[in-house]
Interface confidence: low
């Protein structure tokens, strides 16, 4: 339904509080370097304007599109050229090119200081002094660091953030109450951001068809009792929601996500038996709950897939009449029968099926040609099964930290050109697959592990895209979305890599390492490990282990010393010399 004023429509739909929060998120995701106060001022101006349009939809400029209104507002920022350089050129363009230009300048790794958590009492005072500003600041800081964060979900995080402070700032032991909650929100937030980044990459780099295929597979696993038509409707609506959010249309996205949650809850009888609890919650919790809901039970006595997709004489006729619908039905039927497969595996199987039909439906005897298509699936299924089995065994043997180290070495040897911080971040996240997924029974391991790895490898891809340094990474990232993980798994040691010059400064440590948290200390050690491999890519596991053990002992010794700094200086020189000797540098 057409509205005279889009801004008034969204303001009325969402209410002032959500409207302001979403505009703040949108602006912070576009102008990631702007100070908080500047963004708040812009948001207030937009909100006041929206209110005039609510009062009179025919008022001046109220008929303009949201992109025009928001873009015009962003382009009023005085320091745009000094702060953002060529992004300022976007302002010379007209919509829709201007918005596309802003989108292209979103930075997945903005040069922003690390968020340092103040003392609990300081945070509680700030929360009580001005709750509204405190929560806005949270939205702003998260949004500017995660420019693709799923905006309606960020409202849910903010609601939990507020609840944590409301509860814990009144508790006897504020820190004991608050810190675990903040840690949980931080970890969940990073995971949520990474998952959404994959959805946006899928839409932006591989198109709507790729995203819809992913959605058909995932929703069919989750709602196996729903009919194909129902799943297709949900996929269409979900695609619209994510297209809007990934495109910066956050008000439309939040509104449409809310409507989708409403539709799902009104039609839960024909969708899933697992939705009842979700649908009793308020909206933000409801939408989150639906997105995370467990798979419904598979209907009993589902017929064999072969009848419709292999044995039927009408396969090529059905395929020719509506290719995407027929492939969608194949994916739906396969996915609802296989909650034990990863989504990316299901998509590989669908791709293999499509390739086979393309070839066979042009052959002299199509049925004879595609009769054995399901046999081609066997190696595709076994490859991730075996890989997960091997890596879970390794994880159980080593524990998370050492498993991460094994992956650090593995990936540094595969793509040594990638920056050390990126290799550390990605390998640490890859290593978390162990504690996240290996505890699951066989039937849940693959969907957990391989779909998680897709999210992590996408982080590598988006970070690498900003400053490309490796043709091999570019190739694995761009050739096929569903084959990224097999592509990286198949990479061997890069024989063309010229080892990095040895730099003693890289291996010089100071007493500040002693006051770091266990996690930060691990990152320091893992950074050193990556640098070692870059200096000596052919180093054996044993050599690297010996050096890392020496390094751990060195840190432990100097952190216990009375004069820590002197210890780090003197013992550090000995360690570097010993390491060079051990590695033959």
């Amino acid at each position: 339904d057409a509205h005279k004023s889009e801004v008034a429509h969204r303001f009325k739909d969402l209410g002032e509080e959500n409207f302001k929060a979403l505009v703040l998120i949108a602006f912070a995701q576009y102008l990631q370097q702007c100070p908080f106060e500047d963004h708040v001022k812009l948001v207030n101006e937009v909100t006041e304007f929206a209110k005039t349009c609510v009062a009179d939809e025919s008022a001046e400029n109220c008929d303009k599109s949201l992109h025009t209104l928001f873009g015009d507002k962003l382009c009023t920022v005085a320091t745009l050229r000094e702060t953002y350089g060529e992004m300022a050129d976007c302002c010379a363009k007209q919509e829709p090119e201007r918005n596309e230009c802003f989108l292209q300048h979103k930075d997945d790794n903005p040069n922003l200081p690390r968020l340092v958590r103040p003392e609990v009492d300081v945070m509680c005072t700030a929360f009580h002094d001005n709750e509204e500003t405190f929560l806005k600041k949270y939205l702003y800081e998260i949004a500017r660091r995660h420019p693709y964060f799923y905006a309606p979900e960020l409202l849910f995080f903010a609601k939990r953030y507020k609840a944590a402070f409301t509860e814990c700032c009144q508790a006897a032991d504020k820190a004991a109450c608050l810190l675990p909650k903040l840690d949980e929100l931080r970890d969940e937030g990073k995971a949520s951001s990474a998952k959404q980044r994959l959805k946006c990459a899928s839409l932006q780099k591989f198109g709507e068809r790729a995203f819809k295929a992913w959605a058909v597979a995932r929703l069919s696993q989750r709602f196996p009792k729903a009919e194909f038509a129902e799943v297709s409707k949900l996929v269409t609506d979900l695609t619209k929601v994510h297209t809007e959010c990934c495109h910066g249309d956050l008000l439309e996205c939040a509104d449409d996500r809310a409507d989708l949650a409403k539709y799902i809850c009104e039609n839960q009888d024909s969708i899933s038996s697992k939705l009842k609890e979700c649908c009793e919650k308020p909206l933000l919790e409801k939408s989150h709950c639906i997105a995370e809901v467990e798979n419904d039970e598979m209907p009993a006595d589902l017929p064999s897939l072969a009848a419709d997709f292999v044995e039927s004489k009408d396969v090529c006729k059905n395929y020719a009449e509506a290719k995407d619908v027929f492939l969608g039905m194949f994916l739906y039927e396969y996915a609802r029968r296989h909650p034990d497969y990863s989504v990316v595996l299901l998509l590989r199987l669908a791709k293999t099926y499509e390739t086979t039909l393309e070839k066979c439906c042009a052959a002299a005897d199509p049925h004879e040609c595609y009769a054995k298509v399901f046999d081609e699936f066997k190696p595709l299924v076994e490859e991730p099964q075996n890989l997960i089995k091997q890596n879970c065994e390794l994880f159980e043997q080593l524990g998370e930290y050492k498993f991460q180290n094994a992956l650090l070495v593995r990936y540094t040897k595969k793509v040594p050109q990638v920056s050390t911080p990126t290799l550390v971040e990605v390998s640490r996240n890859l290593g978390k697959v162990g504690s996240k997924c290996c505890k699951h029974p066989e039937a849940k391991r693959m969907p957990c592990a391989e779909d998680y790895l897709s999210v992590v490898l996408n982080q590598l891809c988006v970070l690498h895209e900003k400053t490309p340094v490796s043709d091999r990474v570019t190739k694995c990232c761009t050739e096929s979305l569903v084959n990224r993980r097999p592509c990286f798994s198949a990479l061997e040691v890069d024989e063309t890599y010229v080892p990095k010059e040895f730099n003693a400064e890289t291996f010089t440590f100071h007493a500040d390492i002693c006051t770091l948290s266990e996690k930060e200390r691990q990152i320091k050690k893992q950074t050193a490990l990556v640098e070692l491999v870059k200096h000596k890519p052919k180093a054996t596991k044993e050599q690297l282990k010996a050096v890392m053990d020496d390094f751990a002992a060195f840190v432990e010794k100097c952190c216990k010393a009375d004069d820590k700094e002197t210890c780090f200086a003197e013992e550090g020189k000995k360690l570097v010399a010993a390491s060079q000797a051990a590695l033959g540098l």
């Epitope: 009325k12 809310a258 409507d259 949650a261 409403k262 609890e277 919650k281 909206l283």
Partner: antibody, heavy 120, light 110 residues
């Protein structure tokens, strides 16, 4: 300004009919469920019925048959037939939370009420 | 049908007191419960929904808790403006009696 204004109340004889109106402004009935609630003098609040965004209605068991809720683009109506003395009350219309941004269940906005007196 | 029982029906308290009102549902309603405040001659005003979510513009001294069949409204420090009647209300969109109100608790000056 977001508001609800009831009208149509007054004195009616037992067995008579009355149609109450609730004019809404500042929001759209296509986005919010609307509910009628009544309160007899000095008594509890009593739910009468609800009309959803799509126009479906749901009534309290005691109200079925005698009370009918309907709506057009900006007004919600309560048609009351075969009125009795015990129907004497202040009648409120109330808005549920936004169908999407909060469940259409808690009643987030109320009109000022209109008094209906059933007496001979 | 769901029946909501509120207690006490009347409560005498002074400014600054901590006040607790309870509401019991005849069957489990999960967290589908709201609390309202009503002053003489006025329409009810929403305070809490979904058992514990504070409605917009409501002071933080109002707190809702509970789930299933037992619910509580607490006013941490009673203010002069808080003397009124408080109602609980269940909502269940799967049931024919979508809404059921308690009969109210009148908070009066001691």
């Amino acid at each position: 300004e977001v508001q609800l204004v009831e009208s149509g109340g007054g004195l009616v004889q037992p067995g008579g009919s009355l149609r109450l109106s609730c004019a809404v402004s500042g929001f759209s009935l296509s986005r919010y469920a609307m509910t009628w609630v009544r309160q007899a003098p000095g008594k509890c609040l009593e739910w009468i019925g609800t009309i959803t965004t799509g126009g479906n209605t749901n009534y309290a068991n005691w109200a079925k048959g005698r009370f009918t809720i309907s709506k057009d683009s900006t007004t919600v109506y309560l048609q009351m037939n075969s009125l009795r003395a015990e129907d004497t009350a202040v009648y409120y219309c109330a808005r549920g939370g936004y169908v999407s941004y909060a469940d259409a269940t808690e009643l987030s906005l109320w009109g000022q009420g209109t008094l209906v007196t059933v007496s001979s | 049908d769901i029946v909501m029982t509120q207690s006490p029906s009347t409560l005498s308290a002074s400014v600054g007191d901590r006040v607790t009102i309870t509401c019991q549902a005849s069957q489990s309603i999960g967290s589908r419960l709201a609390w309202y405040q009503q002053k003489p001659g006025k329409a009810p005003k929403l305070l809490i929904y979904y058992a514990s979510t504070v409605a917009s513009g409501v002071p933080s001294r109002f707190k809702g808790s509970g789930s299933g069949t037992e619910f509580t409204l607490t006013i941490s420090s009673l203010q002069p403006d808080d003397f009124a009647t408080y109602y609980c209300q269940s909502y269940d969109y799967s049931s024919s009696s979508s809404y059921a109100f308690g009969c109210g608790t009148k908070v009066e000056i001691k």
